[in-house]
Structure formats: C-alpha cells, structure tokens
Amino acid sequence: FERTRSLQDPCSNCPAGTFCDNNRNQICSPCPPNSFSSAGGQRTCDICRQCKGVFRTRKECSSTSNAECDCTPGFHCLGAGCSMCEQDCKQGQELTKKGCKDCCFGTFNDQKRGICRPWTNCSLDGKSVLVNGTKERDVVCGPSPADLSPGASSVTPPAPAREPGHSPQ
C-alpha cells in the first residue's frame, strides 16, 4: 500500500521536518528556518509560534514541532496552550478590569490568580468558627458548639477509611 501511495503521490515520502517542494519537482526540501512540519507528506511547513511580549519561550521550535510559550514573571497562563498571559495579583486580591483589587470583607483568595471566594459558612455544617478568615485565608471551622458542651469528649472519632483507588477531591 505504501509503495502504491508513493507512486501516486511522491509527496507522501517526505518525512516530518521537510515539505514537498513544488518549485523543485516535488522533491523533499527541509523546512525553512523558524518553521516545522510535524507529520510527513506536507506541502508546506508551518511557521513557528513566536513567544513575544509577555510570552516567553518554554520550548524552542524544532523542524518537527512548534514552539511552546509560557508567561514572563508576574503573569500566568490562561487557556489551552497558554493562549493568553494574565497579570498576577497578590494573595488577598483579585484581578478586575481596573487592576488588582483587595478581596471584599467575607471573601478570600489564597493564590496569585483567580477570584476572591466567600469564606466557608461553618454553621451550615453545624460547626463553629475556630479561626477567623482573612483576605488571604478561609475560615477554619471547628467542632460544633454542642461538641464543646461540658462533659463532651474532645476525642474525635477516626475518619472512615477511603476506598482504594480514589484520590481526595
């Protein structure tokens, strides 16, 4: 089959890193500088992605694979393939259209990216606040008030064993 295919289409013999050059009687020519072909039988080489501006090169382009970019310090990647770089903020902040803004009271962000999230409402689980929340940290919930009544044991029961093969979410 391969032999038949190559008789019909001489370009099918051109390996990755080359292209089938119509200007040279369909011989296999190496990809020009800063271009690549990741598969055989290509009639053109794709131009390499250039990591410019806030992008920086994570992986150099080769004759058979495209360059890969990440972001310069102070920025982080967004989207598949690091299609955009977004400004980092400090912990306790979120990025708005007007720049980095502190988290509103009752919310926190423990990362340099993403949005401020509400503190956990301990009372929904029948628990009390053990450690107050800050802009950078969520509240820490403690035992329920009933558990702290006089005579109640302070020893917590052992946690149930996890099913094998499941990682904690």
Partner: antibody, heavy 118, light 112 residues
Framework: QVQLQESGPGLVKPSETLSLTCTVS????????WSWIRQPPGKGLEWMGY???????QYNPSLKSRVTISVDTSKNQFSLKLSSVTAADTAVYYC????????????WGQGTLVTVSS | EIVMTQSPLSLPVTPGEPASISCRSS???????????LDWYLQKPGQSPQLLIY???NRASGVPDRFSGSGSGTDFTLKISRVEAEDVGVYYC?????????FGQGTKLEIK
C-alpha cells in the same frame, strides 16, 4: 492542506450587525490563532482581531467596541460579528490562520465582499 | 500602534529585471534572538494575499527563491532578483511585533 472558506450575507443594512463564518478544512482548528482581516475596495489591509481555539480573543482597539469573534471547535469554524455597521465597513473580509497571535498569516480564505447599504 | 511606511507606491518593472521595495516601521521590530517581526505579502489581482517572507528574511515554504527579504530594526527590503509576469500585484509589509498588527499602504508592481 489547510483551506479556509468565508460565508455570510453579502449585503447588510446600516446600523445592523454583520455576521460571517469561516470554515476550516484539511486540518484542525486546534493549536492555532485565527484572524479576521478586511480590505475596503481599492484600499489596504486592516487586521480586526483573532481568536485562539480555546476561546481567548484579542481585538483591534479601533474596532474593539463593535467586534466579537467566537469559535466552534466541534464544527471547525470561527465567526465574526461587527455591530452598528456603516458604509465605511464595506469591504472584502478575509479569514486567516494566524501562526503567532497577530503575525504571519500563512493561510487565507478567498475573501467575501460585504456591502453596507440600505 | 506601529506605523508602516512603504516606498515606492508604484513600481513598473521590465520582465527579467530586478525589483526592490522598501518598508520602514515607526519603531524597531527586532525582538529576542535576532528575530524581526516583519512579514511580506503579495496580493495578486483578484486574489487573497499570500505570505512570501516572515521574520524579515525567512522565505515561506513554496515561495520561489527569486524573492528575498533583508533588513533589521526599522528598515526592511523585499527584493525580486528577476521579475516574472506572474509577480504582478500589490506587495504589503506587515509588522507582527505588537497588537494590532499593521500593514504598509502597499506597493503596486506592474510590468512595463
């Protein structure tokens, strides 16, 4: 090899929204940026904006408030919407594969003429 | 935005003779590792533009070797060593360093 084909109405009334779709064949829409570029009759080329297959967009500031580009990876298509059009938006509209996010347009559609007139 | 200026705007050439088009940018297009973010396109009559040169001097695959690009920083040149009848059309330079990418006003090459 990669081919791009623009489609959409050739006539749009002033103040309405121009809508075009670019269908990519002979290759996946993934892993590249995809741009719209226009050319008024007898004039030069103007880049309008790009979209990455993941949905990230960047627009020409001169058009930013009016232009929206979206992508449908399941159909291997991306689309342009330009709102509040005037006669100055009459142009041939090209879609193109953008190798670096605003650079080296290696593959172009054949272009479609959109006339803005009542 | 970066402004691109081409000269001449019209270029009559005899077949077999060389041709040269100049392009100047309002700021340097030289970026890391000596890469100039400048492309050259040819738009033949009634057709879409086609990429000829990228990175200032790299010929796109399949482009005849009579086309060459040179220059760095803000001054660039496209040369055709021997013009053929099929080379007629409008040549555009484009900067690809900053968003928005911007094109020169175009140089119309015609056969004498």
């Amino acid at each position: 090899q990669v081919q791009l084909q623009e489609s959409g109405p050739g006539l749009v009334k002033p103040s309405e929204t121009l809508s075009l779709t670019c269908t990519v064949s002979g290759g996946s829409i993934s892993s590249y940026y995809w741009s719209w570029i226009r050319q008024p009759p007898g004039k030069g080329l103007e880049w309008m904006g790009y979209i990455y297959y993941s949905g990230s967009t960047q627009y020409n500031p001169s058009l930013k408030s009016r232009v929206t580009i979206s992508v449908d990876t399941s159909k291997n298509q991306f689309s342009l919407k330009l709102s509040s059009v005037t006669a100055a938006d009459t142009a041939v509209y090209y879609c193109a594969r953008d190798q670096s996010g605003g650079g080296s347009f290696q593959h172009w559609g054949q272009g479609t003429l959109v006339t803005v007139s009542s | 935005e970066i402004v691109m200026t081409q000269s001449p705007l019209s270029l009559p050439v005899t077949p077999g003779e060389p041709a040269s088009i100049s392009c100047r940018s309002s700021q340097s297009l030289l970026y890391s590792q000596g890469y100039n973010h400048l492309d050259w396109y040819l738009q033949k009559p009634g057709q879409s533009p086609q990429l000829l040169i990228y990175g200032g001097s790299n010929r796109a695959s399949g482009v005849p070797d009579r086309f060459s690009g040179s220059g760095s920083g803000t001054d660039f040149t496209l040369k055709i060593s021997r013009v053929e009848a099929e080379d007629v059309g409008v040549y555009y330079c484009m900067q690809a360093l900053q968003t928005p990418p911007t094109f020169g006003q175009g140089t119309k090459l015609e056969i004498k």
